[in-house]
Amino acid sequence: EDGGPACYGGFDLYFILDKSGSVLHHWNEIYYFVEQLAHKFISPQLRMSFIVFSTRGTTLMKLTEDREQIRQGLEELQKVLPGGDTYMHEGFERASEQIYYENRQGYRTASVIIALTDGELHEDLFFYSEREANRSRDLGAIVYCVGVKDFNETQLARIADSKDHVFPVNDGFQALQGIIHSILKKSCIEILAAEPSTICAGESFQVVVRGNGFRHARNVDRVLCSFKINDSVTLNEKPFSVEDTYLLCPAPILKEVGMKAALQVSMNDGLSFISSSVIITTTHCSDGS
């Protein structure tokens, strides 16, 4: 909305935000960081949730794709008064609850979690946070961590998917703005186009799926191209090739003219899917055409 790079991916985005006592004088910077980042995810199929944690976890805004609700959620976020302990695991519990229960008729949307904290997690709190982050992962989520000020990068690397999923902000809260671009680039998985977008009925084809972030999967062997045919049957196909900006996939043979296949991508062997508005349609092809 404010120009610059944006993400067109259709997935569920969870912000899990530290509102413990230590961020009391820095909540504005956290809020503006979230607000700026939230506006860069612009797919109508993207849902967002705001979760805050201190001595307990609270879902400030449940998953929604409604931009007016997101605007109201941001207003609520701005009003948060920090205080309490750093029970990060409580935040992950609230996210996992939604990841599991907020499925759409058995169709599970891919989940991305961005967790922000400013302090070191002591003993049991780190154990619980890692355990809960692992549960979110087992539910199909990709987990990123933003560490500000007195964080322990080794801890955050174990809570996040890997060291590469940690964004250290060593220069204090005012430096949060400086990592928005890199977080957007790393956390965005988007399907932009399919080539060809029209295929011949009854024939086998390969489809190039153009987009970004396809190699963000924890294991690229688990990436799948998925074709939702005429809004009912879903066929999953293993890509021949997985690159960050494209996938080369076998397209299912669609027997009839006028059939439509909506393109989705799974990063975790079909556990959950990134949606798009990219459609492949069939047409009649005469011999030699």
Epitope: T59, K62, E93, R94, S96, E97, Y100, Y101, N103, Q105, G106, R108, R135, D138, L139, T234, N236, D269, G270, L271
Partner: antibody
């Protein structure tokens, strides 16, 4: 010891009501979703209802929707199933079970028999 | 609603044998499947979660496999205490559903 102890079963007439309870101990109850599952005499398992850890999400089997109400009190470490308008086909052993998706129903209560008969 | 179909409904085997029990979902459920054992007069017991993960404390002779619509529970080197009824259960979407059960009997 992790435990779920059930109470509240018994004999009730068709159209009557009953409230089942499930008391949890030995674990952080508020971190777990909870399910009710039933088993009619000589039959298989049938899922009845689920409630998420924060009570934000509640689901029922079609066969009990509108008649049964699941609830929990995290402060009391307790799960409940309020059963109204009971029918003969509701006769079963009812189990409560804890679950942390995606890890399955790993702890079950001992079961309590509900008999609906005139 | 997703239906779960188990086969066979009963199977006879001897101590030391290997048995396999199949479970089919009416639509894809990824790996959202659990296997439970129930002995007469007892509550069910979780054996396998997420299709192939062995629950803590369950002997390694139990294993699960499959993804999508077709799943298998394998019990190797059958022990006397394994003769019971086994249920699969999908947790991909609500309503949750159990299979009809497979009764494992001593031959």
């Amino acid at each position: 010891e992790v435990q779920l102890v059930q109470s509240g079963g018994g004999l009730v007439k068709p159209g009557g009501s009953l409230r089942l309870s499930c008391a949890a101990s030995g674990f952080t109850f508020s971190s777990y979703s909870m399910n009710w599952v039933r088993q009619a005499p000589g039959k298989g398992l049938e899922w009845v209802s689920s409630i998420s850890s924060s009570s934000s999400y509640i689901y029922y089997a079609d066969s009990v929707k509108g008649r049964f109400t699941i609830s929990r009190d995290n402060a009391k470490n307790s799960l409940y199933l309020q059963m109204n308008s009971l029918r003969a086909e509701d006769t079963a052993v009812y189990y409560c079970a804890r679950v942390r998706p995606p890890y399955g129903m790993d702890v079950w209560g001992q079961g309590t028999l509900v008999t609906v008969s005139s | 609603n997703i239906q779960m179909t188990q086969s066979p409904s009963s199977v006879s085997a001897s101590v030391g044998d290997t048995v396999t029990i199949s479970c089919r979902a009416s639509q894809g459920i990824s790996n959202w499947l659990g296997w439970y054992q129930q002995r007469p007069g007892e509550a069910p017991k979780l054996l396998i979660y997420a299709a192939s993960h062995l629950q803590s404390g369950v002997p390694s002779r139990f294993s699960g496999s499959g993804s999508g619509t077709d799943f298998v529970l394998t019990i190797t080197s059958l022990q006397p205490e394994d003769f019971a009824t086994y249920y699969c259960q999908q947790s991909n979407s609500f309503p949750l559903a159990f299979g009809g059960g497979t009764k494992l009997e001593i031959k």
